[in-house]
């Protein structure tokens, strides 16, 4: 598993550092992030021919995973920081229950599909402190993740395989959305 | 192999309307983490950064040209096309198309155009 | 826009010296930094991205450090072939700037 942020061999050789600023913290936690979902691609991608698979819109129809759009606030043209932030938060809150079906979909990678899940909460609590309009920020209704959950499961293996390859890049994408948005603010 | 290589011509009269493009292979522009980025260097002088197009097609722009720029793609041509009007004697430079692609963003051009001269 | 300042502006070594040149940001941008290598009538070449990491085929004796405002490049044991102009970047936050260059007479 990758070093936690704050914790690589960068802080070691500067011990004069400050502290990390809030931003400092939510970058290096989105990087740390990226980081274990390449690596849970390259299991994904070595298991299956699905990173090379021309069948994606077949199952991507039935995902509704969180994109980044224009109307979002988060893109260059009509940014919005406040509204942004909503949508980043309320993105990642709807990941969350796609990082839990990842869990028990890797062998070798098992502890770093904990990791991504557990450092995507802590990057959340991250963001809910920098974010000023927490009302704006709709929870998953957790009747309804239950039960994505338990359809997603049911689903054959090919699906399955499928399922967890675009789970991993629509997190990846939509997190390099997120840092890029918030490099900006 | 990633090549990219600038189009366009080579002499623009004042206030014209200057359209760059840039065609490249050996990468997608749907891929994310994926950017194309337009670069200038008047003769002897530093680089400059004007404008950049990223895989989801967010665009920037440098703030003092921003007026007088539009950066496009299209990705299925595998082609980004930077239009600048208004052109004047002090724009004459070398103009490089550049990719950056990288999972953490670090908006390092990797590969380079040769470029091409604007007079 | 966040201002970047390279300095010196030019240098003179011979080949297998060792040199080290500064580049400072206006405001913090993290590890946000890369390092470009123009040789004249060429296109710039990237060096190192993210204040510190080598891009892959560039030799050893590059070295980039810093973090925040400060950053240098160090290059041991000098070739020809470094001869040139050296251009830093800010990466954190568009718009993009470079900085002025610092040109390397061997």
């Known amino acids: 598993a990758p070093v936690p942020p704050g914790e690589d061999s960068k802080d070691v050789a500067a011990p004069h550092r400050q502290p990390l600023t809030s931003s400092e913290r939510i970058d290096k936690q989105i990087r740390y992030i990226l980081d274990g979902i390449s690596a849970l691609r390259k299991e994904t991608c070595n298991k299956s021919n699905m990173c090379e698979s021309s069948k994606e819109a077949l199952a991507e129809n039935n995902l509704n995973l969180p994109k980044m759009a224009e109307k979002d606030g988060c893109f260059q043209s009509g940014f919005n920081e406040e509204t942004c932030l909503v949508k980043i938060i309320t993105g990642l809150l709807e990941f969350e229950v796609y990082l839990e079906y990842l869990q028990n979909r890797f062998e070798s990678s098992e502890e770093q599909a904990r990791a991504v899940q557990m450092s995507t909460k802590v990057l959340i609590q991250f963001l809910q402190k920098k974010a000023k309009n927490l009302d704006a920020i709709t929870t998953p209704d957790p009747t309804t993740n239950a039960s994505l959950l338990t359809k997603l499961q049911a689903q054959n293996q090919w699906l399955q395989d499928m399922t967890t390859h675009l789970i991993l890049r629509s997190f990846k994408e939509f997190l390099q959305s997120s840092l890029r948005a918030l490099r900006q603010m | 192999q990633v090549t990219l290589k600038e189009s366009g011509p080579t002499l623009v009269k004042p206030t014209q309307t200057l359209t760059l493009t840039c065609s490249f292979s050996?990468?997608?522009?749907?891929?994310?983490?994926?950017?194309v980025g337009w670069v200038r260097q008047p003769p002897g002088k530093a680089l400059e950064w004007l404008a950049f197009?990223?895989?989801?097609?967010?665009?920037y722009y440098s703030p003092s040209l921003e007026s007088r720029l539009t950066i496009t793609k299209d990705t299925s041509k595998n082609q980004v096309v930077l239009t600048m009007t208004n052109m004047d004697p002090v724009d004459t430079a070398t103009y490089y198309c550049?990719?950056?692609?990288?999972?953490?963003?670090?908006?390092?051009?990797?590969?380079w155009g040769q470029g091409t001269l604007v007079t | 826009d966040i201002q970047m300042t390279q300095s010196p502006s030019s240098l003179s070594a011979f080949v297998g010296d060792g040199v080290t040149m500064t580049c400072w940001a206006s405001q913090s941008i993290n590890d946000y930094l890369n390092w470009y290598h123009q040789r004249p009538g060429e296109a710039p070449e990237l060096l190192v991205f993210a204040a510190s990491n080598l891009q892959i085929g560039v030799p050893s004796r590059f070295r980039g450090s810093g973090s925040e405002t400060y950053f240098t490049l160090t290059i041991n044991s000098l070739q020809p072939e470094d001869s040139g102009t050296y251009f830093c970047?800010?990466?954190?936050?568009?718009?993009?700037?470079f900085g002025g260059g610092t040109k390397l007479e061997i």
């Open positions: 050996g990468f997608s522009l749907s891929t994310s983490g994926v950017g």
């Open positions: 197009i990223w895989w989801d097609d967010d665009k």
């Open positions: 970047q800010n990466a954190h936050s568009f718009p993009l700037t």
């Open positions: 550049a990719r950056s692609a990288d999972d953490y963003l670090y908006y390092s051009f990797d590969t």
